[in-house]
Interface confidence: medium
């Protein structure tokens, strides 16, 4: 988290708010229910309180307005610029101003104002943006999905270096990004994607470049706003620039940022019984079209040029990889060696001679 | 419906540099992701850079570096922008927004020749 300099901030915790106009994209009582919502994430978190003005002048105005809009930091119409907020002071400070040249919604169309609000309202507050992908004041907007929002634990330490912590926080966990160097690292899923990485942890992943050193983190949403926001097995298939990605009984086919028509479709459409309710891993072979999709204690293998299952299929895990243990969390493919990660270690595995060649941790794959 | 115009392809000397246009009719552009595609002389269509609706880019490892993708989409318009040209980027270069199902202009030549 950052702070603004000179630790701007409010030297008193019951603030005042007014909503001084509205966009016609949502009713009066949407955009209520949004802002009050904004306002809640902080003080479930602070001892701050906020109490709604109808007239006169509040800390917190908040207005709607495009292009100019009376304070030369103008709006600069669709898209670009979604909103800004001043730190906390007298006048203009703490007001937040919205560009109704957007769309604003409370789904994922447009843009989501409560988000945006509460993202908005911690500048008001005196937050800096965040340099945490995983935290509200990262200055990237990604709709996080329908489901209760929670505050992510980058801002909570930010806001509460301010203000201190509330009496009692009715939603206790705090998502915390992941370290890619802790030592207890497992990780959801691994494929490549057009010559680079990914590597799913949570509602993250890790891109990393094949010259590179230090992977990026992206949340997973901003790249692909239709997935859920976390995956349990991915696979690429280069030749039909295609990557498949799996959650739960349901899978994706994606190329690029797009996801190809008529997905998602049911794993148990590529011939797994009903009884199967999550793949935790894929690896697919370019050379033999062949795919290993692993499942509990079990893999089974997907013939992707036919698009059936092989026959002989399922079979036990420990039996065709001995010693990898009974279960795979990720795994990927590179010249000749499999690589499958159980918890916070992987193994480097030899199809030329089927077998273990390598024990690493599992964070070694970023550089760690 | 997006219809999609490429421009900017010429012959350019190696090391030289080449910006291409995609300009878009429909004000629907910027719902899409805007990617760039290549195909040369006998061989399959391959992927170049993309750009998603939140400008978040990705490009083929063989132009990282070197390639640079940009949209504006008050403009309705993507760009590519090639630097240190190589004999090996000669291809037909196709602008494409909302992926291989989507929309697909008519490609513009590049050739990288002394």
């Known amino acids: 988290y950052n702070v603004f300099p000179r630790t701007l901030k409010w030297s008193k915790m019951n603030l005042t708010y007014r909503i001084v106009n509205y966009t016609p994209d949502m009713t009066h009582s949407e955009v209520e229910k949004a802002f009050k919502k904004a306002f809640k994430v902080w003080s479930d978190v602070t001892p701050l309180n906020f109490t709604r003005l109808h007239d006169g002048i509040a800390d917190i105005m908040i207005s709607f307005g495009i292009k100019e809009h009376g304070d030369f930091y103008p709006f600069d119409g669709p898209s670009g610029l979604l909103a800004h907020a001043f730190p906390p002071g007298p006048n203009y400070g703490g007001d937040a101003h919205f560009d109704d040249d957007e769309t604003w919604t409370s789904s994922s169309k447009g843009y989501n104002l409560f988000l945006v609000a509460a993202h908005e309202f911690g500048h008001s507050l005196g937050l800096d943006h965040s340099k945490d992908p995983g935290a509200l004041m990262f200055p990237i907007y990604t709709y996080t999905g329908k489901s209760h929002f929670m505050l992510p634990d980058d801002d909570v330490q930010g806001i509460q270096s301010l203000y201190g912590p509330g009496d009692e926080d009715p939603n206790p966990k705090h998502p915390k990004t992941p370290d890619k160097c802790d030592p207890s690292l497992s990780l959801d899923a691994i494929t490549s994607l057009r010559g680079e990485t990914m590597i799913f942890k949570d509602r993250f992943f890790w891109r990393l470049h094949p010259q590179q050193v230090d992977a990026e983190l992206f949340l997973t949403k901003s790249f692909w706003p239709e997935l859920p926001n976390r995956i349990d097995a991915a696979y690429e298939h280069p030749s039909h620039d295609l990557i498949f990605i799996f959650r739960g009984r349901k899978f994706w086919a994606l190329n690029g940022y797009d996801i190809l028509e008529g997905y998602p479709k049911k794993i148990s459409e590529l011939g797994l019984p009903k009884e199967v309710k999550k793949i935790s891993a894929a690896v697919h072979f370019e050379d033999t079209g062949k795919t290993l999709l692993f499942s509990g204690n079990q893999v089974w293998r997907y013939d992707d040029t036919n698009h059936i299952m092989d026959k002989d299929y399922p079979r036990l895990i420990e039996e065709d990889f001995p010693g990898i243990g009974d279960k795979v969390d990720a795994v990927y493919e590179k010249n000749g060696y499999i690589y499958f990660f159980n918890g916070p270690i992987q193994f480097e595995y030899s199809i030329w001679s089927n077998r273990i060649v390598r024990v690493m941790p599992a964070n070694s794959i970023l550089w760690c | 419906e997006v219809q999609l115009v490429e421009s900017g392809g010429g012959l350019v000397q190696p090391g030289g540099s080449l910006r291409l246009s995609c300009a878009a009719s429909g004000s629907t552009f910027s719902r899409y992701s805007m990617n760039w595609y290549r195909q040369a002389p006998g061989k399959q269509r391959e992927f170049v850079a993309g750009i998603s609706v939140g400008r978040i880019t990705n490009y083929a490892v063989s132009v990282k570096g070197r390639f640079t993708i940009s949209r504006d989409n008050s403009k309705n318009t993507g760009y590519l922008q090639m630097n240190s040209l190589r004999p090996e980027d000669t291809a037909v270069y196709y602008c494409?927004?909302?992926?291989?199902?989507?929309?697909w202009g008519q490609g513009t030549l590049v050739t990288v020749s002394s």
């Open positions: 494409n927004a909302g992926g291989l199902q989507g929309y």
